[in-house]
């Protein structure tokens, strides 16, 4: 019987884009590949696997504004920038099965109109796979 | 004879807290969870598996002090901040077995008081499963 | 028949060094180890595998210089400095089979002198195994 | 000119709850600490709660863990204390206070008061 | 839990020296903070790490800590000190205890 090296099982990440957030919402997120381990729903990444997580997130803003990026109701939020324009950062954080994260946005101006984003870019990738996974 | 797809054995990583620094000596740290699959000891964090690490710190200190993150004697230091009243960084770097991961700590005060930490966190995954790890 | 834990393949992962970068070209880049699991060619990393990767670039100029790392032909960089005697930054960026990763630097002195570096050091390291890889 | 105003103190009954809101002006929101702090009639100040700046580390004292909660909302510049399961030992002006180094409280707002009574 | 003891009164006569202390076990290995409130108003930071004054505070305002008191000093007290004052630490589990507060009269 010949012994075949083992395949690593596909590692729990996603990159969804941003174009566009809504003051006092959030950030409208696509997911443009069809082959994501990670799923967005209602706006939100869905956490399935506990564990650490790097979490990148790029983007520049048409006006000034506060941004957070949040992961579960009455926790802090994974980012925080206040009156920015532009963002990119770099973080890691411990999520958990249940765990959904999304944005949260209040621009600064009279206007409500929405935010256009250049280059809107959050990645997520798991960092420790063998942990529980809930599917 | 039924394949499973293999599992991930799991990932050298720890999350330890740290509440307070001595004065010209390091951070008390602490591991919260039993589980983690890696130790402290003599208030270090042991390095069994060589490879590339994702190293994540943050904290905010009662009073302005310089820290390093230290790995092995003779060695410069993974991070060095001087003269900063908090601390949020990420950085990559090559450890290797019987590498300790400590702090190094000395407040510019005149007191010799301990310094106290809110939100102290340091953060090690280990970025190259399948390399050599010694237990 | 006793069961053995798979053990992971190799991760894609190197470091790299530049201690001299030419103006209007690139950095040259070596290898330190023969160990690493991804090859340099023509001054450039070759990229295997399909994923997102973690990059950290680290390093002191000798002199003021604008400095961007690519990675394909018609693509924005995946860094861009503009007039900098150092840098020490991580990035996230999803990479494919066929990239390549290469200096361009600027300087800004009339002299066409190459530019010293002290501390250069670039590492890749793949986020997904598991996925698309040719070797 | 930094100014936090403190708002959503009322007269309640025992086991209900309040949401207190304080907005921060005048300063960068982000970068500070929060805390409350409370006073009741005649008595001198006790800590109730604090969230660094980033938001990473929540601490309570003893006597609300369980039944107050401290926020922040960093778009609105607003901190929040919200309160369940009231007592009428829970009567007390509540103060928000910011601190730029977690230690301190530089800055306070002048306060509202919650009476917890039937 | 940590617990600090002030006296609840002190009196001091005009332009003399008010001394206002704060007991706890071995509270001169912690960070203390002082802190006026006058009447009907909000508490105002005076003295941070036991001796510093933040700015556009006065000079006769000084603090000094060792073994287990610390002690806020008023050199040349004005009827505007008239106040009660407390001192505060952060416990070991980062919860901020304060002091049961002295009140300064001034004659």
């Known amino acids: 019987l010949q012994q075949v090296p083992p395949q690593y099982p596909p590692i729990q990440s996603i990159r969804v884009q941003f174009t566009r957030c809504e003051n006092e919402k959030g950030c409208i997120i696509t997911s443009p590949s069809k082959d994501e381990t990670m799923k967005v729903q209602d706006n939100s990444i869905i956490i399935n696997c506990d564990g650490f997580y790097l979490i990148s997130l790029k983007g520049y803003f048409s006006e000034e504004l506060s941004l957070s990026l949040y992961y579960r109701k009455g926790r802090g939020p994974l980012f925080s920038l206040s009156k920015v324009t532009s963002v990119d950062s770099i973080g890691v954080a411990y999520l958990a099965f249940k765990d959904k994260v999304y944005f949260n946005v209040t621009t600064h101006s009279t206007s409500y109109k929405d935010i256009q984003v250049n280059g809107g870019e959050l990645i997520l990738i798991h960092q420790n796979p063998g942990g529980f996974c809930a599917y | 004879l039924q394949q499973v797809p293999p599992q991930y054995p799991p990932i050298q990583s720890i999350r330890v807290q740290f509440t307070r620094c001595e004065n010209e000596k390091g951070c008390i740290i602490t591991s919260p969870s039993k589980d983690e699959t890696m130790k402290v000891q003599d208030n270090s964090i042991i390095i069994n598996c060589d490879g590339f690490y994702l190293i994540s710190l943050k904290g905010y200190f009662s009073e302005e002090l310089s820290l390093s993150l230290y790995y092995r004697k003779g060695r410069g230091p993974l991070f060095s901040l001087s003269k900063v009243t908090s601390v949020d960084s990420i950085g990559v770097a090559y450890l290797a077995f019987k590498d300790k991961v400590y702090f190094n700590v000395t407040t510019h005060s005149t007191s010799y008081k301990d310094i106290q930490v809110n939100g102290g966190e340091l953060i090690l995954i280990h970025q190259n499963p399948g390399g050599f790890c010694a237990y | 028949l006793q069961q053995v834990p798979p053990q992971y393949p190799p991760i894609q992962s190197i470091r790299v060094q530049f201690t001299r970068c030419e103006n209007e070209k690139g950095c040259i880049i070596t290898s330190p180890s023969k160990d690493e699991t991804m090859k340099v060619q023509d001054n450039s990393i070759i990229i295997n595998c399909d994923g997102f990767y973690l990059i950290s670039l680290k390093g002191y100029f000798s002199e003021e210089l604008s400095l961007s790392l690519y990675y394909r032909k018609g693509r924005g960089p995946l860094f861009s400095l503009s007039k900098v005697t150092s840098v020490d930054s991580i990035g996230v960026a999803y990479l494919a089979f066929k990239d390549k990763v290469y200096f361009n630097v600027t300087t800004h002195s009339t002299s066409y002198k190459d530019i010293q570096v002290n501390g250069g050091e670039l590492i890749l390291i793949h986020q997904n195994p598991g996925g698309f890889c040719a070797y | 000119e930094v100014q936090l105003v403190e708002s959503g103190g009322d007269l309640v009954r025992p086991g209900g709850s309040l949401r207190l809101s304080c907005v921060a002006s005048g300063i960068t929101f982000s970068s500070y600490h929060m805390s409350w702090v409370r006073q009741a009639p005649g008595k001198g100040l006790q800590w109730v709660a604090l969230?660094?700046?980033?938001?990473?580390?929540?601490t309570y004292a003893d006597v609300v863990r369980g039944r107050f909660t401290i926020s922040r909302d960093y778009a609105k510049n607003t901190l929040y204390l919200q309160m369940n399961s009231l007592r009428a030992e829970d009567t007390a002006v509540y103060y928000c206070?910011?601190?730029?180094?977690?230690?301190?409280?530089?800055?306070w707002g002048q306060g509202t008061r919650v009476t917890v009574s039937s | 839990s940590f617990v600090l003891t002030q006296l609840p009164s002190v009196s001091v006569t005009l332009r003399q020296t008010a001394r206002i202390t704060c007991g706890g076990d071995?509270?001169?290995?912690?960070?203390v903070y002082w802190y006026q409130q006058r009447l009907g108003q909000a508490p105002v930071l005076i003295i941070y790490?036991?001796?510093n004054r933040p700015t556009g505070i006065p000079e006769r305002f000084s603090g000094a800590s060792s073994g287990n008191t610390a002690t806020l000093t008023i050199s040349g007290a004005l009827a505007e000190d008239e106040a009660d004052y407390y001192c505060?630490?952060?416990?070991?589990?980062?919860?901020?205890?304060f002091g049961g507060g002295t009140h300064l009269t001034v004659l």
């Open positions: 790490r036991d001796s």
């Open positions: 505060q630490v952060w416990d070991n589990s980062n919860k901020a205890m």
């Open positions: 071995i509270i001169g290995s912690k960070n």
């Open positions: 206070a910011s601190g730029s180094i977690w230690t301190h409280f530089d800055y």
């Open positions: 969230i660094n700046s980033g938001g990473s580390s929540i």
